[in-house]
């Protein structure tokens, strides 16, 4: 089919295109274009007769316009009137017509575009400004970018007027930046000279430097005051209110301690009508003054609270020095020294920070030291403990129970019996007890200065006879040659005799068993596999012996080192290789197989059918334990022979 | 082999002082608590008390506190009773007795008894 | 003081029956021990901690329960059974026996 492809479809003013036929049909006789949709001998353009070649200019030729032999129609020095349809007529040999149609569209090149502003000093905080791209151009598309880069989202950000304005609403220093517009349209895209938004601003509280207060006797004074302004500010210093010079800098030589008092720096921005002040007390001292501790936190909360112990006065050009428990301070992350040395903080404090804390100054001759500054760290209470440990206990005795909790302030205790509040004492006695006074003995901790509460709970059995044992263990899975294990005889009761038994037999002598707790507590040390054997402990008082049940201990070893069977190491071709590994171990290990370094099967058996020369090579079994976390290999290496060619060897499995 | 071997005399006179005593042997008081037990004829047995030989500690039945004394001497591996002010109601089979391990079991061991009678 | 009261006092039962003796405690104890006494013989430990045979004890005998109830009990009676069997508690003081339960054969 005939089609027309313009080439380009967007053509600049000036510029020219190309109407480029494709599908032209063969034997032609001639063919005619014309401006717009249809066929209209007012509106040709040029026709051409093939046979004569010949190009004939229509009413609508205006001299810019070449036709080429294939159709092609190239139009030059375009200008905005050719915007349109072009259609081309064909007539075939057999005077059969056919037509197609073609358009472009035609736009100005665009100009350097500029950027107008309502308000070239706008105030921040208080002043809107509006950009506005220049000139307006129909057809045109705008952009905005800010220091190169696309529009940030912001509510104080406005584009209108078809994005050919651009608002800053409530101005900030921030703002401050290169702005630039840009104008697209489908041939063309340029973009304007930057624009420098110049906020005024400030001035800001002024800052006084150096930070330092306290000054030695003949040293020289130089304060210098900065404050942001747009414009700069101006600057006037006042000491004790009386006004002394207008400069940024104020310096005294040689001062003297009647240099001490109030230093105000006042920061003027003519532009802003603004003024702001800051004052700084500075303090001549006659000659180095003792130093002293200064905490931002003097009840500091465990876990809880930093600390900034700083060290005053603060003097130029000294050297400050810090002890801790009259030690030099420990290098810990939760101790932070600022630049000057001057403050120390502690991180979360624990207990143990409360010091004592001693700062000095070093001068010329020596080291003043401040006097010795103690941390109040409030902490606790801790769970409390009940002492003494006993559980059970025979009637007519005596009960007194201590209960004790680590807290600062000291806890206040309470004590309640099965749930009944008792006494708010820290120890509770009762005397002459009997079996009726058996029950849940609670003591509650309780810190007024944090509001926190700790409890524990005792059971206390009053009987003559003592309950059957039994064994509580610190360690259920030992490592053999690695772990200790402590077996403990409950319960804890008072004027009772414990008593041990290994497979019903009593302790053997070893360096490895040590009874402890008064014999309470049988621990073993560097278990072995041996030791995997039943322990029966046994108590016995005044009225009562009684014995546990046993208790096993599992230990874990191995895997030792492996053993591959049979034991052959030459074979047969045909016959069958059957290995099987072995490891004591426990738990029973995982097994593997490598076979020339190979990774085979993960079997305890390996099995290979009809083997031939081929499968010559070592044979690795690997065994882990993941218990233990140990591994273990043996290497074989197995020859296999041609039938016949080596009398004696085994026929194999 | 643990035995307990009593003596002392089978006859009492009234308000005078009954006296007896057990020597252990086999294995050693100081580790033990020993106790003593009685048997009036035809009657109940009665728990009488426990002393610990290591310290002297000892606990008395209410029913006889104030006139019953138990004593132990580990250098003779014996302990003995002593039962003041005594009455007929104080006739009866007097036992030592002791529980302990022999070995890996828990055993109970007691002396033959002595009958001793309160009478004038 | 804890009482203990046994029963029945006394007993008359044949070869191979099925024997029990019940001991009720008027407070709960941790455990109950039973004694056997031969006539002229000191006791002898025979179930302590209300179920465990003392050594060298058959095992036709049996002890249960918890509290304040407990049940000594033969399976099947035997002649040499023939005695006069305790209860006794341990848990408080004073330790109390109770008044025995004397065993005969039918």
């Known amino acids: 089919k005939l089609t027309i492809e313009s080439t380009p479809f967007n053509v600049a003013e000036g510029k020219e295109v190309l109407l480029l036929v494709h599908n032209l049909p063969q034997h032609l006789f001639g063919y005619s274009w014309y401006k717009g949709e249809r066929v209209d001998g007012n509106r040709q353009i040029i026709g051409y007769v093939i046979g004569t070649q010949q190009a004939t200019p229509g009413p609508a030729y205006s001299g810019r316009e070449i036709i080429y032999p294939n159709a092609s129609l190239l139009i030059q020095n375009i200008i905005q009137n050719d915007t349109g349809f072009y259609t081309l007529h064909v007539i075939k040999s057999d005077l059969v017509n056919e037509e197609a149609t073609g358009q472009f569209r035609v736009y100005p090149e665009l100009p350097k575009p500029s950027i107008s502003s309502n308000n070239s000093k706008p105030v921040e905080d208080k002043d809107a400004v509006a950009f506005t791209c220049e000139p307006e151009t129909q057809d045109a598309t705008y952009l905005w970018w800010v220091n190169n880069q696309s529009l940030p989202v912001s509510p104080r950000l406005q584009l209108s007027n078809g994005n050919r304005t651009l608002t800053l609403f409530n101005v900030t220093r921030n703002d401050t930046a290169s702005y630039k517009c840009e104008t697209q349209n489908p041939v063309s895209a340029r973009r304007s000279d930057s624009v420098i938004l110049n906020v005024l601003y400030g001035p800001d509280a002024p800052t006084i430097s150096p930070l330092n207060t306290s000054y030695r006797s003949g040293e020289n004074l130089n304060l210098s005051c900065h404050a942001a302004s747009n414009p700069p500010a101006q600057y006037s210093w006042f000491v004790n209110g009386t006004f002394q010079q207008s400069t940024q800098e104020l310096f005294i030589p040689n001062i003297t301690v009647n240099n001490s008092g109030s230093y105000t720096c006042q920061a003027h921005n003519s532009d802003t009508g603004l003024n702001r002040t800051t004052v700084t007390t500075i303090t001549v001292y006659a000659e180095p003054p003792k130093p002293f501790i200064t905490s931002n936190n003097s009840n500091p909360v465990e876990d809880e609270d930093a600390v900034a112990l700083t060290c005053e006065p603060e003097i130029q050009n000294t050297t400050y020095l810090w002890w801790v428990n009259n030690q030099s301070l420990p290098v810990s992350p939760r101790l932070q020294l600022s630049n000057d040395n001057r403050t120390l903080t502690l991180l979360s404090v624990t207990r143990n920070d409360v010091g004592p804390y001693e700062c000095g100054i070093q001068n010329e001759l020596s080291v003043d030291h401040s006097d010795p500054v103690i941390l109040n760290v409030l902490y606790g209470p801790d769970d409390p403990t009940i002492s003494p440990s006993y559980t059970y206990y025979r009637p007519g005795v005596n009960l007194s129970l201590s209960c004790h909790a680590a807290s600062n302030p000291p806890a206040q205790y309470s004590w309640l019996i099965d749930g009944n509040i008792q006494q708010h004492t820290q120890e509770l006695f009762i005397s002459n007890i009997t079996e009726k006074n058996s029950g849940l003995y609670t003591c509650q901790a309780n810190n007024s200065a944090s509001g926190h509460s700790r409890t524990t709970v005792k059971t206390i059995t009053v009987s003559a006879e003592l309950p059957k044992p039994s064994i509580s263990s610190n360690n259920s899975k030992p490592v053999e040659d690695k772990d200790a294990v402590a077996f403990t005889c409950e319960p804890e009761a008072q004027n009772t005799t414990y008593l041990w038994w290994v497979n019903g037999q009593s302790l053997p002598v070893s360096p490895r068993l040590q009874l402890s707790n008064g014999n309470r507590t049988l621990t073993l040390f560097n278990v072995t596999r041996n030791d995997a054997r039943a322990y029966v402990c046994g108590i016995q008082n005044s009225v009562s012996a009684n014995r546990s049940d046993p208790v096993t201990l599992d230990v874990l070893y191995g895997p030792d080192t492996p053993i591959i069977s049979p034991p052959d190491s030459s074979y047969l071709s045909g016959a069958n290789l059957n290995l099987s590994c072995h490891s004591a171990s426990n738990p029973s290990p995982q097994y593997s197989w490598r076979i020339n370094g190979i990774p085979q099967q993960h079997t305890q058996v390996l099995f290979i059918a009809k083997i031939t020369p081929n499968n010559n090579g070592t044979y690795a079994c690997f065994v882990s334990n993941l218990a233990t976390g140990r591994n273990n290999s043996i290497v074989k290496s197995i020859t296999v022979s041609a039938s016949g060619t080596s009398p004696g060897l085994s026929a194999g499995a | 082999e643990v035995q307990l071997q009593q003596s002392g005399p089978g006859l009492v006179r009234p308000s005078q002082t009954l006296s007896l005593t057990c020597t252990a042997s086999g294995f050693n008081i100081k580790d033990n608590y020993m106790h003593w037990v009685r048997q009036p004829p035809g009657r109940c047995l009665e728990w009488i008390g426990w002393i610990d030989p290591e310290n002297g500690d000892t606990e008395y039945a209410p029913k006889f506190r104030g006139r019953v004394t138990m004593l132990a001497d580990t250098s003779k591996n014996q302990f003995s009773l002593r039962l003041s002010s005594v009455t007929a109601a104080d006739t009866a089979v007097y036992y030592c007795?002791?529980?302990?391990?022999?070995?890996?079991?828990?055993?109970?061991?007691w002396g033959q008894g002595t009958l001793v009678t309160v009478s004038s | 003081d804890i009482q203990m009261t046994q029963s029945p006092s006394s007993l008359s039962a044949s070869v191979g029956d099925r024997v029990t003796i019940t001991c009720s405690a008027s407070s709960s104890v941790t455990y109950m021990h039973w004694y056997q006494q031969k006539p002229g013989k000191a006791p002898k430990l025979w179930i302590y901690?209300?179920?465990n045979l003392a050594s060298g004890v058959p095992s036709r005998f049996s002890g249960s329960g918890s509290g304040t109830d407990y049940t000594f009990t033969i399976s099947s009676l035997q002649p040499e059974d023939i005695a006069t069997y305790y209860c006794q508690q341990r848990s408080t003081y004073p330790l109390t026996f109770g008044c025995g339960t004397k065993l005969e054969i039918k």
């Open positions: 007795h002791v529980l302990i391990y022999a070995g890996y079991l828990a055993m109970d061991y």
């Open positions: 901690s209300t179920s």
